[in-house]
């Protein structure tokens, strides 16, 4: 990793050891610099791999909800708008980081939690298994 | 949103007010249970919207290395392995949490930052804007 | 408790249109998606289509120019419209609950939840 | 669309014996991305709604009893009754998932001799 030097104006910190803990301003800072409108909006819809996004909500988890991604078919969607079997629609997935509240039901106490989440779908060639 | 009934062995928190600053374990649990092997490993490649992975690096923020997706073509690759213009490569986004160290180059200090990211790519529909 | 239940008239004449609301209780619309199967008397099922949670809708091409789904949030109901009736389509007809299954990224089309049915008889 | 063929289409059985439900699919129900089996089956007793038993091949559904199972790959499915109950009687219907429009067995009749 890349070493940083310290800035002498850092708060103290009295665990210097792992489970690191850690102070975090929950006051988010939206670094978005995308000014499109559209974004991935419609793109579930207009997708040759079209998926719907099912509402994941847990209060002991923040943000309490993620937005998750189903792929509609297992086929892809061709230009007469039929389901071509012969290409697959797969989930894209990403690990993400999110905050669970530890101990349970604390308010000011987190542990970071990695999840995998599925954000959209995408259309790929089927790997053919040859059969020796 | 959800009222939680609050713990009592909660540790105590000064700043009662926002911004709001909380404690965070940074000892990462992972939660992904899903045992799909294949995942999204291989699909930037088998994908008729094919994209490229770029890293992302950034000492400042947690994770600092994040792997950003661009599409390769502007069109779709058909069936013959070409590119085709009349379907439009667009990446999926999404927005994700990340730790910021405030105020820099701290250690044990951090403020929650939303940053816009590329997934992967799908293959859509091209919007059709009629001229009057 | 999951529950879904068809209503609607009993007997529809024929060239006219098929009407059925399905209500439903103890799940969240917003997750699930809903799909109309029918069984004409002493056959085996039949899907005609689904609405999507987010509203989106897929047909049975065999109805595809007749059939329209769709759901009424607010009073959590969904409605099968079939036009054009004939003799052949008298059957019971149910709506199902495709079944949800967390970490798992593609919509299912089997159906872990179904109505009581409701009998459709097209006649003059 | 995609054909579902039963076999047998009546099927007389002994209560404790076991019972076997044969399923054939006109097209393979194996997804290539994850190597599942997209078949389901379904009991529809008398005078009731299907319900769900098994799926993805040989999940069982929540609450279904062990004694039924379900196996095949491809086009090739078989429900397994391990020791008949005289609850288990009604018509049994297999279903694939995957190709739209999704489609059922024309059932298989299981009665008490």
């Known amino acids: 990793g890349i070493t940083i030097p310290r800035n002498p104006g850092c708060p103290n910190s009295e665990d210097k050891n792992f489970p690191r803990t850690v102070m975090v301003n929950l006051n988010i800072h939206n670094r978005n610099t995308n000014t499109n409108p559209k974004r991935s909006s419609d793109y579930y819809n207009r997708s040759t791999s079209p998926w719907n996004l099912h509402r994941n909500e847990d209060p002991e988890r923040y943000p309490s909800v993620i937005w998750e991604a189903k792929c509609r078919h297992l086929g892809c969607i061709n230009a007469d708008g039929n389901v071509d079997y012969h290409m697959n629609s797969v989930p894209i997935q990403q690990e993400i980081l999110v905050l669970r509240r530890e101990p349970p039901h604390c308010p000011n106490s987190f542990r970071l939690e990695k999840i995998l989440v599925s954000v959209g779908c995408t259309c790929v060639t089927p790997i053919v298994h040859h059969v020796a | 949103g959800i009222t939680i009934p609050r713990n009592p062995g909660c540790p105590n928190s000064e700043d009662k007010n926002f911004p709001r600053t909380v404690m965070v374990n940074l000892n990462i649990h992972n939660r992904n249970t899903n045992t799909n092997p294949k995942r999204s490993s291989d699909y930037y490649n088998r994908s008729t919207s094919p994209w490229n992975l770029h890293r992302n690096e950034d000492p400042e923020r947690y994770p600092s290395v994040i792997w950003e997706a661009k599409c390769r073509h502007l069109g779709c690759i058909n069936a013959d392995g070409n590119v085709d213009y009349h379907m439009n490569s667009v990446p999926i986004q999404q927005e994700i949490l990340v730790l910021r160290r405030e105020p820099p180059h701290c250690p044990n200090s951090f403020r929650l930052e939303k940053i816009l990211v590329s997934v992967g790519c799908t293959c859509v529909t091209p919007i059709v804007h009629h001229v009057a | 408790q999951v529950q879904l239940q068809e209503s609607g008239p009993g007997l529809v004449k024929p060239s006219e249109t098929l009407s059925l609301t399905c209500t439903v209780s103890?799940?969240?619309?917003?997750?699930?998606?809903v799909s109309w199967i029918r069984q004409p008397p002493g056959k085996g099922l039949e899907w005609i289509g689904i609405?999507?949670?987010?509203?989106?809708?897929d047909y049975n091409s065999a109805f595809k120019s007749r059939v329209t789904i769709s759901v009424d949030t607010s009073k959590n109901q969904f409605s099968l419209k079939l036009s054009s009736v004939t003799a052949a389509d008298t059957a019971v007809y149910y709506c199902?609950?495709?079944?949800?299954?967390?970490?798992?990224?593609?919509?299912?089309?089997?159906?872990?939840?179904w109505g009581q049915g409701t009998l459709v008889t097209v006649s003059s | 669309d995609i054909v579902m063929t039963q076999s047998p289409l009546s099927l007389p059985v002994t209560p404790g014996e076991p019972a076997s439900i044969s399923c054939k699919s006109s097209?393979?129900?194996?997804?290539?991305?994850?190597?599942?089996?997209?078949l389901a089956w379904y009991l529809q007793k008398p005078g009731q709604s299907p319900q769900l038993l098994i799926y993805?091949?040989?999940t069982r559904q929540s609450g279904v009893p062990d004694r039924f199972s379900g196996s095949g790959s491809g086009t090739d499915f078989t429900l397994k009754i391990s020791r008949v109950e005289a609850e288990d009687v009604g018509v049994y219907y297999c279903q694939q998932s995957y190709y739209t429009p999704y489609t059922f067995g024309q059932g298989t009749k299981v009665e008490i001799k």
């Open positions: 103890g799940f969240s619309l917003p997750s699930h998606s």
């Open positions: 097209q393979s129900l194996l997804f290539s991305e994850n190597q599942k089996n997209y």
């Open positions: 609405i999507w949670n987010q509203g989106g809708t």
């Open positions: 199902a609950r495709n079944a949800y299954i967390t970490d798992y990224y593609y919509e299912n089309y089997f159906f872990d939840a």
């Open positions: 993805w091949t040989s």
